[in-house]
């Protein structure tokens, strides 16, 4: 039941002081990692 503030997409843009590495270090769920690598593919 319930969850959290759901993101429609992983990142529209990097937030202040965030790098791809710092985001990578915060990922928790399988879905987080999937969104992250999808984001990387789309930004190439």
């Amino acid at each position: 039941g319930g969850g959290g503030s759901k993101h429609k997409c992983f990142r529209n843009s990097l937030e202040n002081n965030e790098t791809l590495e710092s985001i990578m270090n915060t990922l928790e769920s399988e879905e987080d990692f999937r969104k992250y690598f999808y984001y990387l593919e789309g930004s190439k």
Partner: antibody
């Protein structure tokens, strides 16, 4: 339904070790990050540690860094907290908690297990 | 680290009262704020996520609002089962941090 059943608490002397377990059921345990949160007697809640899907990322609070180790066994659907070099100030009820992912709120908690560090 | 300051630390209220608890973050956390209810000897229960979204199964007498640094939890009409301690928590960044709690007692 989702269940997080904890075990492993007890009384331990300062400097000794203890391992807590959190057995999960009712959801795809291996797909989610898991957390430990603690509460000293009569005090508020304090985040302790997190382990990600696959154990890729681990983070700890400054108060336990270097002494506690979070781990998981996805084949057993179980989360662990190995606590070494225990101190009196580690005395608390320890809770495991689940959330859907980074920047999601906790949705389920274990029942808690009391760790008492005393000589 | 992001500090979460909750107020008041305790309050006395009567059944039927409207109760408001506030939580302030030391820096902006967007809407990455949750509220929990805890009764003595029990695990916390998740009430609200995303500052204002009700967890599944939580009655609508609970509501949350706010964004950025200032947040509130409101109980529209206090019932006997609502006497408990309430905590806010930010989950914008590690380390995840909690407010100090607000104990709601019977007047």
């Amino acid at each position: 339904q989702v269940q997080l059943v904890q075990s492993g608490g007890g009384v331990v002397q300062p400097g000794r070790s203890l391992r807590l377990s959190c057995a999960a059921s009712g959801f795809s345990f291996s797909s989610f990050g898991m957390h430990w949160v603690r509460q000293a007697p009569g005090k508020g809640l304090e985040w302790v540690a997190v382990i990600s899907y696959g154990g890729i990322n681990k983070h700890y609070s400054d108060s336990v860094k270097g002494r506690f180790t979070i781990s998981r066994d996805d084949s057993k659907n179980t989360l662990y907290l190995q606590m070494n070099s225990l101190r009196a100030e580690d005395t608390a009820v320890y809770y495991c908690a689940k959330r859907e992912g980074y920047r999601y709120a906790y949705d389920y908690w274990g029942q808690g297990t009391l760790v008492t560090v005393s000589s | 680290d992001i500090q979460m300051t909750q107020s008041p630390s305790s309050l006395s209220a009567s059944v039927g009262d409207r109760v408001t608890i506030t939580c302030r973050a030391s820096q902006g956390i967007s809407n990455y704020l949750a509220w929990f209810q805890q009764k003595p000897g029990k695990a916390p229960k998740s009430l609200i996520y995303g500052a204002s979204s009700l967890q599944s199964g939580v009655p609508s007498k609970f509501s949350g609002s706010g964004s950025g640094t200032d947040f509130t939890l409101t109980i529209s009409s206090l019932q006997p089962e609502d006497f408990a301690t309430y905590y806010c928590q930010q989950y914008n960044s590690y380390p995840l941090t909690f407010g100090g709690g607000t104990k709601v007692e019977i007047k």
